[in-house]
């Protein structure tokens, strides 16, 4: 047993039929010695009486908030949570496996620079009794500081016959250098609990492989004279890092017939401008990725032909 | 180049032969389809290559101050990845296929490294790990975890060589 | 928190075959060569065998080469050891255990509780 | 002949020191390898301790006291792992380890009785 934070405590249990449990006491706290009861929850039922209270928790049943009274006044609470462990291995029911980008991903993470500030969010059935707590650092054994928000439900979306909520946090390093090679990973650790049961979820990754920049803004098109082509300019987004002498971004143009089908012609540069083709009914789009570490693309920018 | 008295490098070249390294490095270990290695408290793994850190003045205020400090760093860094990828580690079984681009990445890593110190002047070098006689799974795994350290490091100095070529080129 | 957890252990007569499985969580299994090593009651650490983190190199010690087979899932996290012909000198806790791999050394981090294979008619 | 010899036991005394040798057959130079070491509590696994090669190339495990330190003996191409101030936690099986030959190869262990 461990306290999670004042007064709430998490029962660690191997989760198996007719597993034995784990014994807890509970110590009332107050300075009183005598006439003190033990309840449960809303109920009435004395469980015991004393200083402390001996229980054998196996179940769901045996968690939830004990109170201890005297003479009608309550005297102090301890809410006890269960983390079940099946098969040597901690549940994992609160939060949706998204996959991605591999299996048991809870936890998923992207930065739009090198500032130190990222967003993490993740999925869940659950609609109610459910709280959560992030907390983050950098590096594990000497861990640096990193202030992450409250989460919040940032999504909701059906899923066939479920509904499934997004949410998100946002995070801060707090002593951020843009400009150095990382050599300690950020640690992100999600404490969830969705009425009696607590779970922890994980996720280590470095700022590098989580930055997705913005897409290009102002993308404008310049027809040229006597000529189907066009020049496709373009302008870093404002979220990313600056001087771009420093923080420099590749770009992929694409020129994208109205039908999927038809074939897409690539153009990769390093300037914020191309010449492409451009076709009736066809449409231009821009994505950006940093120009010297493979992280993840951005969304694309797109502009009509026409 | 980077001389005794300090002068400067030859930023253009090396922005060139630094944004190669940086598409070699990917080019061999792309990421898709491989496991991923940003390790749990891995700690003691970072430790064992050399690193661009906050007080390095590799960022774009302290290259105008004194580039000396970084480009020194740096140096250390591409000998240190040259020897790497030049020992028992690589060149050991299993073999790398044959068109591996490992070979390239290794002679452009001793290329920039040469263009930043030309011979006659001696910057210290970071010192190598002894390497034990490694296993062949061990040297399958290192391969992969010095790649994808490698490519964290050529980028921050392809970074430091674009701003370097943009903003101090004489 | 990592966590290995072996299973499949028994008695087992000897020539017959027996499956362990060792369990992983808490850390990215693919990025870990993974060992197996007995301990025969009241003696020492025996290795016998290794696979590397993508299951292509696979090493047995003398004493179980042809008879055991190591081997990994990595979608679900699990380590395996087929043993067949088992003989009496076989009976042993059976460990897994995790590999840290670096520059300068190698060696078994975590390691699984054990689980007992007793061979005997 | 055993590719790595430990004494099969030692005694001694809380607050005193232990020299735990792991010896490495002949043809097979110790000053060429990396030298692990475990304990082992009765009934759990073995945990790792250190590693040593040289002054400048050793290791202490995460966690591990500065009361357990390694070294070698050249002349007698052994291994050494030095316990001082011996405490009664300290009571365990010792081993000593290298790779060699694609191969990871553990010594028959030292049971160190703290009396």
């Known amino acids: 047993i461990w306290e999670l934070k004042k007064d709430v405590y998490v029962v660690e249990l191997d989760w198996y039929p007719d597993a034995p449990g784990e014994m807890v006491v509970l110590t009332c706290d107050t300075p009183e010695e005598d006439g003190i009861t033990w309840t449960l929850d809303q109920s009435s039922e004395v469980l015991g009486s004393g200083k402390t209270l001996t229980i054998q928790v196996k179940e769901f049943g045996d968690a939830g908030q004990y109170t201890c009274h005297k003479g009608g006044e309550v005297l102090s609470h301890s809410l006890l949570l269960l983390h079940k462990k099946e098969d040597g291995i901690w549940s994992t029911d609160i939060l949706k496996d998204q996959k991605e980008p591999k299996n048991k991903t809870f936890l998923r993470c992207e930065a739009k620079n090198y500032s130190g500030r990222f967003t993490c969010w993740w999925l869940t059935t659950i609609s109610t009794d459910l709280t959560f707590s992030v907390k983050s650092s950098r590096g594990s054994s000497d861990p640096q500081g990193v202030t992450c928000g409250a989460a919040t439900l940032s999504a909701e979306r059906v899923r066939g016959d479920n509904k499934e909520y997004e949410y998100s946090v946002e995070c801060q390093e707090d002593s951020a250098c843009p400009a150095a090679e990382e050599s300690l990973p950020i640690e992100v650790m999600v404490d969830a609990v969705h009425k009696l049961k607590y779970e922890n979820y994980t996720s280590s990754f470095f700022i590098r492989d989580i930055i997705k920049p913005d897409p290009p803004k102002n993308l404008q098109l310049k027809p040229l004279k006597n000529s189907r082509q066009v020049e496709v300019s373009w302008e870093y987004p404002d979220t990313w890092s600056t001087p771009h002498s420093y923080f420099s971004l590749t770009f992929c143009v694409q020129v994208q017939g109205k039908s999927k089908r038809e074939k897409k012609d690539r153009v990769f540069t390093d300037k914020t401008s191309a010449t492409v083709i451009c076709r009736k009914n066809a449409s231009i789009s821009v994505r950006a990725q940093d120009r010297y570490y493979s992280s993840s693309w951005s969304e694309w920018a797109s502009v009509p032909c026409s | 180049r980077a001389v005794p008295g300090g002068s400067s490098p030859a930023w253009t070249q090396c922005q060139q032969l630094s944004q190669k390294l940086c598409t070699l490095a990917w080019s061999a270990h792309p990421l898709v389809g491989h496991m991923d290695l940003r390790e749990e408290g891995d700690e003691e793994t970072t430790n064992d290559v050399p690193h661009i850190q906050c007080g390095d003045g590799c960022d774009p205020q302290g290259l105008r101050d004194n580039s000396q400090f970084c480009l020194q760093r740096i140096h250390q860094g591409l000998i240190f990845y040259e020897k790497l990828l030049g020992s028992d580690i690589f060149t050991g079984e299993p073999s790398l296929l044959p068109d591996s681009p490992v070979g390239q990445l290794h002679a452009s890593l001793l290329g920039l490294s040469q263009l930043l110190q030309p011979e006659g002047h001696h910057w210290e070098t970071q010192q190598i790990p002894s390497l034990s006689p490694s296993q062949p799974w061990q040297r399958l795994l290192l391969r992969f975890k010095i790649l994808r350290s490698l490519q964290a490091f050529v980028a921050v100095a392809a970074r430091v060589f674009a701003h370097g070529a943009a903003t101090l080129s004489p | 928190q990592v966590q290995l957890v072996e299973s499949g252990g028994g008695v087992v007569q000897p020539g017959r075959s027996l499956r362990l499985s060792c369990a992983a969580s808490g850390f990215t299994f693919s990025s870990y060569a993974m060992h197996w090593v007995r301990q025969a009651p009241g003696k020492g650490l025996e290795w016998l065998s290794v696979?590397?983190?993508?299951?292509?190199?696979?090493y047995y010690a003398d004493s179980v080469k042809g008879r055991f087979t190591i081997s990994r899932d990595n979608s679900k996290n699990t380590l395996y050891l087929q043993m067949n012909s088992l003989r009496a000198e076989d009976t042993a806790v059976y460990y897994c255990?995790?590999?840290?791999?670096?520059?300068?050394?190698?060696?078994?981090?975590?390691w699984g509780q054990g689980t007992l294979v007793t061979v005997s008619s | 002949q055993a590719v790595l010899t430990q004494p099969s036991s030692l005694s001694a005394s809380p607050g005193a020191s232990a020299s735990l040798t792991c010896t490495l057959r002949?043809?097979?130079?110790?000053?060429?390898?990396?030298i692990y070491w475990y304990q082992q509590k009765p009934g759990s696994p073995p945990q790792y301790l250190l590693r040593y090669k040289s002054d400048s190339d050793k290791q202490q495990g995460s966690g591990v006291p500065s009361r357990f330190s390694g070294s070698k003996d050249a002349s007698a191409n052994a291994g050494i792992l030095l316990i001082s101030g011996l405490q009664s936690e300290d009571e365990a099986d010792y081993y000593c380890?290298?790779?060699?030959?694609?191969?990871?190869?553990f010594g028959g262990g030292t049971k160190l009785t703290v009396l």
């Open positions: 002949s043809g097979i130079n110790v000053g060429t390898y990396r």
């Open positions: 255990a995790r590999e840290r791999t670096t520059l300068s050394g190698s060696y078994f981090d975590y």
């Open positions: 380890m290298i790779w060699h030959s694609s191969a990871s190869v």
């Open positions: 696979i590397s983190h993508d299951g292509s190199i696979k």
